[in-house]
């Protein structure tokens, strides 16, 4: 049987002779040279050679464990004379023994990392990793330890993990933003004689809102004319903030001062400036100087830095208003007045008031722009601005009168202002209802009692035009003796009904019925209208045969009775034919 074990060979042999590996030996070998040793497998004959007589194995070349840590070979012992094996072929291994010939290598030549400024000590920044090609299972050749060569006292590295952390309190980006840290990785557990490698870590401090805005000056002064319309920019102020990005965003506001309601401040998002603008119309005569307190504040505040103080600053803004010569100003932009339509001439409706806003307080006089009141219905007292009627009004003719009043400075007629007056004429129930049309109707001589011969409608010019409730009745003087009755339908219509059986056109050819119409409003208005009823001869079919001719050629045409039809283009005979009057034997 074979007498050998696995062989160990130190890597990176530097001797001048071949490196001895070991000896193959069979107990069949009597030392007489009758056996021949043969080597085959990984590197046999090239890397590894064998003395065929003695079985000694040597390595011909310098071996690198990191390149190949194990070689598998086969050994044979054969009878030199017969060539037959005296031992079965056996496999053996040559294991390359590690030496510390590799330094640790970082995964990156340069690392980049960020960490917020003002971070707590021990805040994780980045983890670096170095690897060592040596055998980790034997000795400490591959046991890497990390240390910091450059970057103290700002940062530290955990020796075993390579985790870089902040090491200094209150690192301020505004003071220093960039740090270059050099980390060493050393094998042999960091002991003397270990190999090492380094890497560079570029660390940038990111911004946090740790700086409040600051005005570079405590007072600003601007000027603006009193005529500046709302929205006019007056001036710009700028607070500086050492932070960047959204942490340096600034909102401006007016926090105090007499001009709080007169001015606005808006933030220019591009420049982060505060633009002071006019909010309301200024008046030099009321106030010449405004002093505002303007505040600049960060909208994005980090609560943990509030202990540093408020993240805002304030400055005083003094605004001087320049005088501009102005026309008179009315107390209102427009005046709405009301007057009843039954107002007498010289009735006062109301008054307007205007004043010279300038410091001079020039007196003003008032007048009506006659282009807006051609009929001279209204007048104004030039001194006190009282408006009064100079003619009678009628709401039904004109509901609204829109006139313009002018106020002029007496000492400077070029300075004048105009104001619209909207005068509403209030309704008074001063119109009586009247028939909607001229009513002329017909009745057959043989008509029966209670037959409807005409429906009446009324209209009223008063308000509400379509909302009146009318009552109809025969005038009292006709009520008792009338041959007809009025039936009020309670829907703003009334019917004329026959009151008796039969009429004689030879006795009475035409009836005039006085009908009283009243509105149910207050003061009560009523009128009397007359309805003409003609008595006609009719045949047994209810067709009219003869009537007084004037009934048929009345300029307003015919108002036909119940169940009747009327064609405006009919001839005279056709008209007779068209009148269908119901009657009963």
């Amino acid at each position: 049987s074979w007498m050998w074990n696995q062989f160990f060979l130190l890597e990176e042999y530097t001797g001048s002779d071949y490196q001895y590996v070991g000896k193959l030996h069979s107990d069949q070998d009597r030392g007489d040279g009758s056996l021949k040793y043969i080597l085959s497998g990984d590197g046999a004959g090239d890397l590894f050679i064998i003395n065929e007589n003695t079985g000694d194995i040597q390595a011909t070349k310098r071996l690198d464990r990191e390149e190949k840590p194990v070689y598998i070979l086969r050994a044979q012992a054969v009878n030199r004379r017969t060539g037959r094996p005296v031992e079965p072929e056996s496999e053996f291994i040559i294991k390359i023994h590690d030496i510390n010939d590799n330094e640790p290598i970082f995964t990156k030549d340069v690392y980049t990392a960020t960490v917020p400024e003002m971070a707590d000590v021990g805040t994780f920044v980045v983890q670096v990793t170095a690897t060592d090609a040596d055998d980790p299972t034997y000795g400490n050749s591959a046991k890497v330890v990390y240390s910091i060569l450059q970057g103290q006292p700002y940062f530290s590295v955990e020796s075993e993990t390579g985790i870089i952390k902040t090491a200094l309190l209150n690192m301020d980006r505004e003071n220093r933003e960039q740090y270059q840290v050099v980390i060493q990785a050393k094998d042999m557990g960091g002991q003397m004689g270990g190999l090492s490698g380094t890497t560079t870590v570029n660390i940038t401090l990111t911004d946090v809102n740790d700086n409040p805005p600051r005005f570079p000056q405590s007072t600003y002064q601007f000027k603006t004319p009193e005529s500046s319309p709302p929205g006019t920019p007056i001036g710009r102020i700028k607070a500086s903030d050492a932070d960047v990005g959204e942490n340096a965003e600034i909102e401006y506001s007016i926090t105090d001062g007499e001009g709080h309601e007169m001015f606005d401040v808006i933030t220019d998002q591009e420049t982060q400036e505060g633009i002071i603008t006019v909010k309301k119309l200024l008046d030099f005569e009321k106030k010449k100087v405004y002093t505002l307190k303007v505040e600049a504040s960060n909208p994005h505040v980090e609560p943990r830095f509030l202990y540093l103080g408020p993240f805002k600053d304030s400055a005083t803004v003094r605004i001087v208003v320049d005088d501009v010569d102005e026309p008179p100003v009315f107390s209102k932009l427009a005046y709405i007045l009301q007057i009843r339509e039954d107002a007498r001439i010289n009735t006062t409706i109301g008054s307007v008031a205007a004043q010279d806003p300038d410091a001079a307080r020039n007196p003003v006089k008032y007048s009506v722009d006659r282009h807006t009141d051609m009929d001279r219905i209204f007048n104004i007292d030039s001194g006190n601005g009282s408006i009064f009627t100079s003619k009678l009004l009628d709401r039904e003719t004109l509901l609204w009168h829109n006139i313009t009043v002018i106020a002029t400075e007496i000492n400077n007629p070029k300075q004048s202002s105009r104001v619209p007056l909207y005068i509403k004429v209030l309704d008074v129930n001063d119109n009586a209802p009247e028939f909607a049309e001229f009513y002329e109707t017909f009745v057959c001589e043989k008509a029966k009692a209670d037959q409807l011969i005409q429906t009446l409608r009324a209209v009223d010019k008063d308000d509400p035009y379509s909302g009146h409730q009318f009552s109809f009745s025969l005038a009292p003087e006709a009520a008792s003796s009338s041959n007809f009755t009025i039936q009020d339908n309670k829907d703003n219509t009334a019917g004329i009904l026959t009151r008796k059986n039969g009429y004689n056109r030879h006795e009475m050819s035409t009836y005039l019925l006085p009908v009283v119409i009243s509105d149910n409003d207050y003061p009560v208005q009523s009128s009397t209208g007359t309805v003409t009823v003609r008595v006609c001869a009719c045949d047994h079919h209810g067709n009219m045969q003869s009537c007084h001719a004037e009934a048929l050629i009345h300029p307003t045409g015919l108002s036909t009775g119940a169940g009747s039809e009327f064609r405006h283009d009919s001839g005279l005979n056709d008209i007779f034919e068209a009148q269908k009057i119901e009657w009963h034997e």
Epitope: P464, S473, P476, V516, N520, D521, P523
Partner: antibody
């Protein structure tokens, strides 16, 4: 159907105030003038006040002039009577009534009693 | 103050005819229509006659009205027990744009 419903009556001391309301339904309230009529206990009917359909014209009996104010809210179909400086002789049942048919009052409310007493 | 004059009371036996008069002036009855109201005990007035002589629907034709000059009258025929009530005449007054009432007449149905 037409309905008029008064409310707001009650006991009040002389010199006090009261506001009566009359809720109208079943007709176009804004087209009619409206009246208040009162009836003292055991006495006849006495017209009190009238208001035009739009509310722009009003009139009062001499006995209440300057103390009573009639008004209306057409959007709410409601008639009002504001009574100030009340006297013992104002004690009565107050009716709201609609004038129609040539000023005949065709519809009346059920009435609300106002008692002025110390 | 009462402007129209009515008798304080009238009476009649069932089936009889009674009339109630009402007199005024030219500014009221003389130039405007007359209306009549019936008031049963404890109830609101009810329109009985309008436009001098017209009856609203539901009012029996036993009730009729008339007007002459500055006077008006209400006639009730076929008197019935349920007719016992107070009756008031009324008119619009054109002079001061107000409504005027009579003092009321108490109708008693005898027996």
């Amino acid at each position: 159907q037409v309905q008029l419903l008064e409310s707001g009556g009650g006991l009040v001391q002389p010199g006090g105030s009261l506001r009566l309301s009359c809720a109208a339904s079943g007709f176009t309230f804004s087209s009619f003038a409206m009246n208040w009529v009162r009836q003292a206990p055991g006495k006849g009917l006495e017209w009190v006040s009238v208001i035009s359909s739009s509310g722009s014209n009003t009139n009062y009996a001499d006995s209440v002039k300057g103390r009573f104010t009639i008004s209306r809210d057409n959007s709410k179909n409601t008639l009002y009577l504001q009574m100030n400086s009340l006297r013992a002789e104002d004690t009565a049942v107050y009716y709201c009534a609609r004038p129609s048919y040539f000023q005949a009052m065709d519809y009346w409310g059920q009435g609300t009693l106002v008692t002025v007493s110390s | 103050d009462i402007v129209l004059t009515q008798p304080p009371s009238v009476s009649g036996a069932p089936g009889q005819r009674v009339t109630i008069s009402c007199s005024g002036s030219s500014s009221n009855i003389g130039s405007n229509f007359v209306s009549w109201y019936q008031q049963l005990p404890g109830t609101a007035p009810k329109l009985l006659i309008y436009d001098n002589s017209n009856r609203p629907s539901g009012v029996p034709d036993r009730f009729s009205g008339s007007k002459s000059g500055t006077s008006a009258s209400l006639a009730i025929t076929g008197l019935q027990a349920e007719d016992e009530a107070d009756y008031y005449c009324s008119s619009y007054d054109s002079f001061d744009h107000s409504w005027v009432f009579g003092g009321g007449t108490k109708l008693t149905v005898l027996g």
